[in-house]
Amino acid sequence: DVERTTCPPEKEVHEIDESLIFYKKRELEACVDAALLAAQMDRVDAIPFTYEQLDVLKHKLDELYPQGYPESVIRHLGHLFLKMSPEDIRKWNVTSLETLKALLKVSKGHEMSAQVATLIDRVVVGRGQLDKDTADTLTAFCPGCLCSLSPERLSSVPPSIIGAVRPQDLDTCGPRQLDVLYPKARLAFQNMSGSEYFVKIRPFLGGAPTEDLKALSQQNVSMDLATFMKLRREAVLPLSVAEVQKLLGPHVEGLKVEEQHSPVRDWILKQRQDDLDTLGLGLQGGIPNGYLILDLSVREALS
């Protein structure tokens, strides 16, 4: 329970203003009324409060809004946002992109990835889906933030906005997120010609299935090794040596550099050594000649 002290009459607060920077923590607790603070939130960010003072102001708002802050307060949080935990943010309902922009600006340069991820999640929930305006805001104010959304939230992305996503926006996306985004991208770019299609689909290929990689291998796309290394292990393993050679084109030599790293290492282990030898790269670890390959996973599935 909070230790209660009475506000001295001469310290009574009628306005949120610069005089409050001279208040000790206990004085702020006793003298600043949360309802007054909420009503004058637009003034707070212009006042150079210490982090300890901001802590008190946060606790005041928590006192007033136990079920989470209303957007009228959230949009004016300013540096108070730095005091918010993901648990605090999870209680919010945010629909305004102006609010999102303001808080993304504040969070820049601070280690707040969990808070920002939760904030974006609340915006997507509040707006019903990740619409084009929201995506544009994210790409402009928080490159990479798209990948902070859960696969469930990303599933609400309409294919029409995929075109606005830049390759760098996907750098931090994990496999489960790319699994969701890839089919949308495939749909969004389906009417493009081969080379143009590959340029557009490349950042999303971490979510591509084996069949699509096989199809790409027939199109002389010359996939760079960085993209190949981000492909799903399960999608790469069934590819033949010939298909990988066609897929990578002149970049196939890079397999030697990456032969100890997944998915290349795992793919090598699945190939016949004499097939690997045809590449002339000195890749080792394939299945020796004359060995029979039994896929036990298939047998287990049947039994």
Partner: antibody
């Protein structure tokens, strides 16, 4: 169901004291701002005071400042108004009300308790 | 302190008519912080409108609020017999949380 029940009103002489109570139920009292509002006979509403739930930060109308003290006992879900140095102009029905911070209004009121200051 | 002035003091109308009540603030009040209450004789007040224009739970849609800055309006589109009462506006932007002096809506 939200309920607010005031008690403690009555007849008191000028200069005397009285303590009003308001028993709250049907909501999380420990998370809620509470207010007192009064209404003199035949007159309009006058906001008197309020108190925050955790820090017990208080605010008062100028007309009662220094004479009235609002307080709460969260363990008993009860709001109080200690009235000292009472004057004839303090005669009124005193209402206890719940302040809804999300709607920014007094969304539930008690039935009121009459305080009469007279010699 | 913010002074709220309500007009008219009394409004004499018949059931079915439209009632328009005014509340003027001595300084600008954010619309989020303006509420309207209804009070019938012998009863406690009841929250009608909050945030200048949002109806409180259970309030019929014949009641509507509007306005911003210093001028706010409560409108009852079609007076029902149970609407004859006193109406108060209140601001909660700054302390004290003042009320207007009230407008009495009486049967003509």
């Amino acid at each position: 169901e939200v309920q607010l029940l005031e008690s403690g009103g009555g007849l008191v002489q000028p200069g005397g004291s009285l303590r009003l109570s308001c028993a709250a139920s049907g909501f999380t009292f420990t998370q809620t701002y509470m207010s007192w509002v009064r209404q003199a006979p035949g007159k309009g509403l006058e906001w008197v005071s309020n108190i925050s739930p955790t820090y017990s930060t208080t605010n008062y109308a100028d007309s009662v400042k220094g004479r009235f003290t609002i307080s709460r006992d969260n363990s008993k879900n009860t709001l109080y108004l200690q009235m000292n140095s009472l004057r004839a102009e303090d005669t009124a029905v005193y209402y206890c009300a719940r302040y809804n911070a999300y709607q920014i209004g007094l969304d539930y009121w008690g039935q009121g308790t009459l305080v009469t200051v007279s010699s | 302190e913010i002074v709220l002035t309500q007009s008219p003091g009394t409004l004499s109308l018949s059931p079915g008519e439209r009632a328009t009540l005014s509340c003027r603030a001595s300084q600008s009040v954010s619309s989020s912080y303006l509420a309207w209450y209804q009070q019938k004789p012998g009863q406690a007040p009841r929250l009608l409108i909050y945030g200048a224009s949002s109806r409180a739970t259970g309030i019929p849609d014949r009641f509507s609020g509007s306005g911003s800055g210093t001028d706010f309006t409560l409108t009852i589109s079609r007076l029902e017999p149970e609407d004859f009462a006193v109406y108060y506006c209140q601001q909660a932007l700054g302390y004290p949380h003042t009320f207007g002096q009230g407008t009495k809506v009486e049967i003509k």
